[in-house]
Structure formats: C-alpha cells, structure tokens
Amino acid sequence: AGHLEQPQISSTKTLSKTARLECVVSGITISATSVYWYRERPGEVIQFLVSISYDGTVRKESGIPSGKFEVDRIPETSTSTLTIHNVEKQDIATYYCALWEV
C-alpha cells in the first residue's frame, strides 16, 4: 500500500511570494496514482484545492482562480509538489496531500 510523507512540518513565506510544499509517495509508483491536495484553514472545514491524476490530468477547485495553485508530479523523486502563487494571509492553513491508488 502507498504511504505519504510531507517532509516540511511548516513553511514560512513572505506575502506575495511563492510557496512550494512537498508530498513524498512511497510503497507505490507515483505515476500509477492520483495525488490530491487539500487545505484546512483555522476553524474551517477541509477544502479540496487541486489534484493530478495518474495520466497527468490536473483538476482544480472552481472557487479558486486558475493560476493560484500549481501541482506537479516528479516520478524520479516520487514527489508531488503544490505551488502556491501570490502568497497571502488567507493561505495560512494546514495543507494535506492524499493518494488514490488506481
């Protein structure tokens, strides 16, 4: 079964800059999975942000402008990266990655 690890316990960024969060997949080939990213803001329910499927198709949450989040998958390092553009106070949250095995 697949296992996920988010090596960055926390990340601090300057406003308007770019943040990159990593999710390392082990126990399964990342190219055979779909990786989902969610965020949980303080006091709010968890929210889907973006996903990248086994075939590379990206899907995003409709309420968020299309350029805000970027998701990538690097098979060589078995890592999925969530890039947050134009970091703002509303981005303060806990970010989770999740795996769907095909």
Partner: antibody, heavy 116, light 107 residues
C-alpha cells in the same frame, strides 16, 4: 444558460477613473472564481484581474495598484474599478467565469477608450 | 512571466482539410493550457482545457494535444464556420498569459 453581461465602458481621459460591471446569471455565482480579461486594439488578450469565491484578489503587475476587482455575491455582480487610466488600457474588457475549467464562459465585452 | 508563442499568425486551409495550430510555452506548464476560438465580431469561446479536454458542446473535430511546453490544436474536417482566430492560454501560474493568436483563413 450561463450568461455574463458587461457594462460601464466609455471614453475616459488619461488619469481618469471608470467602474465596469458584469451581471452573471444561470449558475451559482458565489461558487466560482471570476476574472476580467481585456483585448487590445491589436487583438491581443491580456489577463487583468481574478477574484476567488471568497474574495481574494489577484492582478498582473501592469494594473496592480490601479485596478480593483470585487464581487457582490448577493446580487451576482462582478466589478472592476479602474483608476489612473492610461492610453494602453484602451481595450475591450470581458468578464469570464474562472476556476476550473478556466474561462469557460465569456461575456460580450464592454469597450474602454482612454484618450484626451 | 510565461510567454505563449503562436508562431503562425495566419493559416490557410480548405473545407474538409485538417489543420494544426501550434503554441509553445517558455517554460513547463504541464497540461494547464486552454484554447479559445474567436470569430469576427464575437467574444472568445472556450474550446479545450487541460490541453486535450473539450468543453461541453465543442464538436469532436477539435482536438487538443501536448504537455510541458509544446501544444497543438488540430481541426479535422475543417468547416466554413471555423473561420476564426485561435488563442492558446496557460493557467499554470500567475500571471495568466495568452498566445498572440493564429487566424484561420478558409480558401
């Protein structure tokens, strides 16, 4: 049927201000990100501003500090307040439904001309 | 900023032919590319998203392909109503950017 109708365009002198509106119907407006895109007289498309369903705003450097995008989810209206207008802001302004999939519906556009 | 280059400003084709419009991104944008059609006097209409997915109601003669930096919009069995300008766009990251457009002319 999704419908986006822009209004508010016109002729403005350099340095002037103008507010554009976009009335949305046919979908749950409050659930979608929205954007403004302009088309220059040379027919180039340029992204102008985006706003999330929750009100977070995003701009390219070319309009940052001069343009403000906002929304009224109760009335299903998207706005673009423009100030310190320049001749290079002359364009057809379109509102578009953003989010995912992006820019799937566009309005018919409203024209802004900045000239003395 | 990511530059989207459509090197062909004009393309000429005949009804029934197959034509390919190309777009090159200045850096990797994955599959975060959309294509739009703009007919004379009209606003842009969405054709393709995620590089290869057709928007609802778009005829299946329109096909998108590519990933990374190179993208193609192929129109098979070209119809007279396909006379239009075609724009690519990347939505991988801000600022969102568009190609300069390729105008399709029907012989």
């Amino acid at each position: 049927e999704v419908k986006l109708v822009e209004s508010g365009g016109g002729l403005v002198k350099p340095g002037g201000s103008l507010k554009l509106s976009c009335a949305a119907s046919g979908f749950t407006f409050s659930s979608y990100a929205m954007s403004w895109v302009r088309q220059t007289p040379e027919k180039r498309l340029e992204w102008v501003a985006s706003i999330s369903s929750g009100g977070s705003t995003y701009y390219p450097d070319s309009v940052k500090g001069r343009f403000t995008i906002s929304r009224d989810n109760a009335r299903n209206i998207l706005y673009l307040q423009m100030s310190s207008l320049r001749s290079e802001d002359t364009a057809m302004y379109y509102c578009a439904r953003d989010g995912y999939p992006p820019f799937d519906y566009w309005g018919q556009g409203t024209t802004l001309t900045v000239s003395s | 900023d990511i530059v989207m280059t459509q090197s062909q400003k004009f393309m000429s084709t005949s009804v029934g032919d197959r034509v390919s419009v190309t777009c090159k991104a200045s850096q990797n944008v994955g599959t975060n590319v959309a294509w739009y059609q703009q007919k004379p006097g009209q606003s842009p209409k969405a054709l393709i998203y995620s590089a290869s997915y057709r928007y609802s109601g778009v005829p299946d003669r329109f096909t998108g392909s590519g990933s990374g930096t190179d993208f193609t919009l192929t129109i098979s069995n070209v119809q007279s109503e396909d006379l239009a300008e075609y724009f690519c766009q990347q939505y991988n990251s801000f600022p969102l950017t568009f190609g300069s457009g390729t105008k399709l002319e029907i012989k």
